[in-house]
Amino acid sequence: IPVIEPSVPELVVKPGATVTLRCVGNGSVEWDGPPSPHWTLYSDGSSSILSTNNATFQNTGTYRCTEPGDPLGGSAAIHLYVKDPARPWNVLAQEVVVFEDQDALLPCLLTDPVLEAGVSLVRVRGRPLMRHTNYSFSPWHGFTIHRAKFIQSQDYQCSALMGGRKVMSISIRLKVQKVIPGPPALTLVPAELVRIRGEAAQIVCSASSVDVNFDVFLQHNNTKLAIPQQSDFHNNRYQKVLTLNLDQVDFQHAGNYSCVASNVQGKHSTSMFFRVVESAYLNLSSEQNLIQEVTVGEGLNLKVMVEAYPGLQGFNWTYLGPFSDHQPEPKLANATTKDTYRHTFTLSLPRLKPSEAGRYSFLARNPGGWRALTFELTLRYPPEVSVIWTFINGSGTLLCAASGYPQPNVTWLQCSGHTDRCDEAQVLQVWDDPYPEVLSQEPFHKVTVQSLLTVETLEHNQTYECRAHNSVGSGSWAFIPISAGAHTHPPDEFLFTP
C-alpha cells in the first residue's frame, strides 16, 4: 500500500499556502483527486509529488494515491482543507445526474471542518427542501440525498453558518433520471386495416416511456412518413402520437406500415398491413370437411370462418332437413371475432338425436351480398339385427335384417347347444356374407341390409346366430330351433340414451 507524506488523514491550510503531498510506493504510483487547478504533479523514482505554491479553496478535496501495478489495488488518501473565510464551500460539479432510487451526492466540500455544525442543504433562492427529502452530510464529500426521486430534480445550494450569517455555495443542479427498463412501449392501431378504394382511413402510431428522450416514427413500405407529432404526459409516462389520416384511399396507400420507437435502451417496432380493395367482399370457409359423420348421442361443433369487409349485416344458422322443420336454438350458435375482418361462427350440436341428422347451412350477408356454406351431417348407428325363419322357393331360409350406419357387414355362425350368443368353443361353422342385399339406403338414414342363410334341415340342438358390425359397434340375433317350431333370442335390449 502506498504511503502519503504528511502521514495525516486530513490537512488544514490557509489560502496562499504551499502544499506538498508526497506518495511513496514499491513501484510507480499515481495521484488522483478532484480536477482542481493549480496543482503541479511530478515523479521522482518510486514517489510522486503533488504540489501547489498557492493553495486556494478550490484545492479542497480528497487526494488518493494508487499503485497501478499492485494486484491488490491498494491506495492511500489524504483530505485537504483550504480554509478560506470568504469561501466556505468548494463545489466540484455544476450538475449531478443519477437514476431514481440511487443516492445523489451533491459535492459541496466544506473548506473549514469547524463549520460542520452549522451546515444545511436548501433549494435555490432559499426555498426549503421538498418534504420527505432524506439527506446526510460529510465534510469530505458533501450532501447526499438518499434514494433520490425524479421529483427531487431541482437546483440546490449548500449553506454554512459563518459569524452568525448563512453563506451559500454556488448552485448544483440535480437531475434524477427515470430508470428506463427498455425501449419505449408501442401501439399501432388498427392491427390490420381494409378499405374500399375511395374510403377514409386512419392509422395511429403511439409510443410511451418514463423518459422523454425517445424518438418515434411511422413508415410505409420502408419510407419514413412526415407526420406531425402530438406529445402528452400522463400516468407518469411521456407519450408521443403520430396519426396518419387518409381522406380517400387508393391502391398506392396499401402495404406494410411500421411504427418504430427508440431510446438509449434500444428499438421497438410493430407492423400492420393495410389492404385496399376494389369492392366489398364476403368469403366463407371451414377447416372442417363439409360432410360430417358423428355417432348418435355424441356432440359436434360446426365451425365457419368468415372474412368480410365491410362488416356483416346479418348471419344465421339454418337446418334444411330432411327430418323436421326445427331450427337450431340460438343459444347453441356462438360467434367469436378473431380480428376486425375475420370471425368464427360455431354451431354446437350436443347429444345428437336421430332427427338432427341432415343439412345445416350458415348464411351471412354484407354489402357484398349473401353467401352460404352448407354442412351435411350423417349420424352413425351401431347395427340392429333381427332373424326370422321362412321358406323361399320351398327352401327353409334364415333371413337376417341388419340396420345401421355405416352399412353393416353380416356374419352367420352355427354353434352347438342352445345359447344367446355363440362363443368360440361352441362354433361349428362360420359364413361371411360379403354382399348382403341393401334394402334401403337414403341420405342421412340408416342403411338396412338383408342376408339369407338357406338351411335344408334345422338341427334342433344347435343355435344359428346372425352377427352384424360396423365402425360404431355390433349387434346379433340368436335363432334356436325347437321341436314345436322356431325360438328366437334377441340380444339384451340395445340401450339408447340420446
Epitope: 499515481e30 495521484w31 488522483d32 483527486g33 480536477p35 482542481s36 487547478p37 493549480h38 496543482w39 503541479t40 504533479l41 511530478y42 503533488l50 488518493r64 466540484l92 460539479a93 455544476q94 450538475e95 449531478v96 445526474v97 443519477v98 440511487q102 445523489a104 451526492l105 459535492p107
Partner: antibody
Framework: QVQPQESGPGLVKPSETLSLTCTVS????????WSWIRQPAGTGLEWIGR???????NYNSSLKSRVTMSVDTSKNQFSLKLSSVTAADTAVYYC???????????WGQGTLVTVSS | QSVLTQPPSASGTPGQRVTISCSGS????????VNWYQQLPGTAPKLLIY???QRPSGVPDRFSGSKSGTSGSLAISGLKSEDEADYYC???????????FGGGTKLTVL
C-alpha cells in the same frame, strides 16, 4: 490495462439527440473522472465535459445547455447525450479517463458521428 | 478558434531537434500546468507530457516539456519518422472553468 470503448449510432438527424455510451474494460470506472472529447474532421480537440462516478458533472460552457452525462457503475459505463444537434456537431467522439484536471491518460479509439438528414 | 495557440505545422529531418510552442494567457497556462498529447494518423490522442515536464512511463526521453509564464513548449530531439503526428497542448482555464486545447501542430519528418 484500462480500455474505454465508445458506442452509439454513427448517423444522427439534425435537431435530434446524439447518444453515446463509453464502456470501460480492464478496470473499474469507480473513483475516477471520465471525460468526453470530440474532434471535428481536420481540426483540433474540444473538451465536452466530465463525469465522476457519483454522477457529478462539469461541462464545457459553450455546450452546457445541450449536454447531459450519466454514469452506470453496475455496467462500468457512462454516457453522453447532446441534444438539438446540427452539422457542426459532426466529429469523432472520444471518451477518456481524466486525472488531476487535463491529464487524459486512457482514451477510447473514438467513434465518428455524422449529423445529416 | 482555439484558446491555446499553436503553430499549424512544424517540420524537421531525422535526428534533428524540433520545438512546438503553445501560447496561452494568465487564466490557463499562466496559473495551471500544461499537458501535451500526440495523435498518430488515424488513432486516438495519447498522453505525452503532463504537468509541464513529466513523462508517463513508456514515453521516450527524446520528448521533453517546459513552461514559462503563459507559454508552454514541447521539444523532440533525435527526430524519427514515427514522430510524424499531430501534437496538442492542453491546460485548465480558470475563467472558462474547463479544459482548453491548442489547435494542434502537424509535425512532418522530412
Amino acid at each position: 490495462q484500462v480500455q474505454p470503448q465508445e458506442s452509439g449510432p454513427g448517423l444522427v438527424k439534425p435537431s435530434e439527440t446524439l447518444s453515446l455510451t463509453c464502456t470501460v474494460s480492464g478496470g473499474s470506472i469507480s473513483g475516477y473522472y471520465w471525460s468526453w472529447i470530440r474532434q471535428p474532421a481536420g481540426t483540433g480537440l474540444e473538451w465536452i465535459g466530465r463525469i465522476y462516478t457519483s454522477g457529478s458533472t462539469n461541462y464545457n460552457s459553450s455546450l452546457k445547455s445541450r449536454v447531459t452525462m450519466s454514469v452506470d457503475t453496475s455496467k462500468n459505463q457512462f454516457s453522453l447525450k447532446l441534444s438539438s444537434v446540427t452539422a457542426a456537431d459532426t466529429a469523432v467522439y472520444y471518451c477518456a479517463r481524466e486525472r488531476m484536471a487535463t491529464i487524459f491518460d486512457y482514451w477510447g479509439q473514438g467513434t465518428l458521428v455524422t449529423v445529416s438528414s | 478558434q482555439s484558446v491555446l495557440t499553436q503553430p499549424p505545422s512544424a517540420s524537421g529531418t531525422p535526428g534533428q531537434r524540433v520545438t512546438i510552442s503553445c501560447s496561452g494567457s494568465s487564466s490557463n497556462i499562466g496559473s495551471n500546468t500544461v499537458n501535451w498529447y500526440q495523435q498518430l494518423p488515424g488513432t486516438a490522442p495519447k498522453l505525452l507530457i503532463y504537468s509541464n515536464n513529466q513523462r508517463p512511463s513508456g514515453v521516450p526521453d527524446r520528448f521533453s516539456g517546459s513552461k514559462s509564464g503563459t507559454s508552454g513548449s514541447l521539444a523532440i530531439s533525435g527526430l524519427k519518422s514515427e514522430d510524424e503526428a499531430d501534437y496538442y497542448c492542453a491546460a485548465w482555464d480558470d475563467s472558462l472553468n474547463g479544459v482548453v486545447f491548442g489547435g494542434g501542430t502537424k509535425l512532418t519528418v522530412l
